[in-house]
């Protein structure tokens, strides 16, 4: 999916109002210095591409993020403010229901969410630069 035509201001507002709080709650008990940020992004569409990938694509050591509250909210905001995004999710939703995994917060998941927080902050910064 090409995130170029999204309403970035609306996505930023949703992130600051609610998604950020859920990410921070997920990370509670860990320090910001516990993990190194290894994933970066260069512009707003690129940041959203990386955010989508880290949030919804299961990895061998962290398969459960898509069911978290911050992930559900991320999916909702992308569906709302990115033209045509929702239709790309119809088949993806069916597949996700089939591979529902037991919810376990592993260290790898915490590391992945730490990366997500960094990507979202980068997204906000690139937005501020544009303004």
């Amino acid at each position: 999916y090409d995130f170029t035509n999204c309403d970035f201001q609306k996505i930023e507002a949703d992130y600051l109002r609610t998604i950020s709080k859920d990410l921070i709650t997920y990370m509670s008990g860990t320090k910001s210095t516990d993990f190194n940020n290894t994933v970066s992004c260069s512009n707003r569409p690129h940041c959203l591409t990386e955010i989508q990938s880290l949030t919804f694509n299961p990895t061998p050591r962290c398969a459960s993020l898509a069911k978290e509250m911050f992930a559900r909210k991320t999916k909702a905001t992308l569906a709302l403010w990115c033209p045509g995004y929702s239709e790309t999710q119809i088949n993806a939703t069916q597949a996700m229901k089939k591979r529902r995994k037991r919810k376990v917060t592993t260290n790898k998941c915490l590391e992945q969410v730490s990366q997500l927080l960094g990507l979202w902050r980068r997204f906000i910064r690139t937005l501020l630069k544009k303004q």
Partner: antibody, heavy 120, light 107 residues
Framework: QVQLVESGGGVVQPGRSLRLSCAAS????????MHWVRQAPGKGLEWVAT????????DYNQNFKGRFTISRDNSKNTLYLQMNSLRAEDTAVYYC?????????????WGQGTLVTVSS | DIQMTQSPSSLSASVGDRVTITCRAS??????VHWYQQKPGKAPKLLIY???QSISGVPSRFSGSGSGTDFTLTISSLQPEDFATYYC?????????FGQGTKVEIK
């Protein structure tokens, strides 16, 4: 089963206000956006506004922004449409409809509608 | 805003006829089109979503096709209960917009 029930319609004079309600039941409220759609007598459907409980955000048709405001009471699973400075052209049946925001993404359930008549 | 133009605005047909209604979007919207049926005094009812996806409980005589800007709703064999008004809707981007409707009447 899913139920959406609108209320609050009636006859109102131009320039006055009215508040419509949409009570939702039979599903998880936060899994769906709620939309208001209206239909003037003998006319087509017109999208008015939406509220997304999961994100606590709303969006409006520019034609109504400033005059119409959405609010909600989560404890009652109820959505409201506050309509101010009403005009004769706001006369319509007002429907609420739900739409999945993390799945389905379509208005799959509608209320029965409530008629608003703006007349002096 | 994306405009949705439906045609025809009305048509007369007989029971058993094959009926085709078209909807054209003012810009490409991939497959983000849904079709509704509305009977007098009733709320719209979802028939087809995302251009061609069928809904459980909706008779198989209703089908949809198209992508980009041109979309079609087909009723393969019109039944007495199908006389109603049909609307297309786009949810590609806000504000969501509807076609002006096609009224299917008895010939």
């Amino acid at each position: 089963q899913v139920q959406l029930v609108e209320s609050g319609g009636g006859v109102v004079q131009p320039g006055r206000s009215l508040r419509l309600s949409c009570a939702a039941s039979g599903y998880i409220f936060t899994d769906y956006a709620m939309h208001w759609v209206r239909q003037a007598p003998g006319k087509g459907l017109e999208w008015v506004a939406t509220f997304i409980p999961l994100l606590d955000t709303s969006d409006y048709n520019q034609n109504f922004k400033g005059r119409f405001t959405i609010s909600r009471d989560n404890s009652k699973n109820t959505l409201y449409l506050q309509m101010n400075s009403l005009r004769a052209e706001d006369t319509a049946v007002y429907y609420c409809a739900r739409m999945g925001v993390t799945h389905s993404y379509v208005m799959d359930a509608w209320g029965q509608g409530t008629l608003v008549t703006v007349s002096s | 805003d994306i405009q949705m133009t439906q045609s025809p605005s009305s048509l007369s047909a007989s029971v058993g006829d094959r009926v085709t209604i078209t909807c054209r979007a003012s810009q490409p919207i991939s497959i983000s089109v849904h079709w509704y049926q509305q009977k007098p005094g009733k709320a719209p009812k979802l028939l087809i979503y995302f251009a061609s996806q069928s809904i459980s409980g909706v008779p198989s005589r209703f089908s949809g096709s198209g992508s980009g800007t041109d979309f079609t709703l087909t009723i393969s064999s019109l039944q007495p209960e199908d006389f109603a008004t049909y609307y297309c809707q786009q949810t590609f981007s806000l504000p969501y917009t509807f076609g002006q409707g096609t009224k299917v009447e008895i010939k």
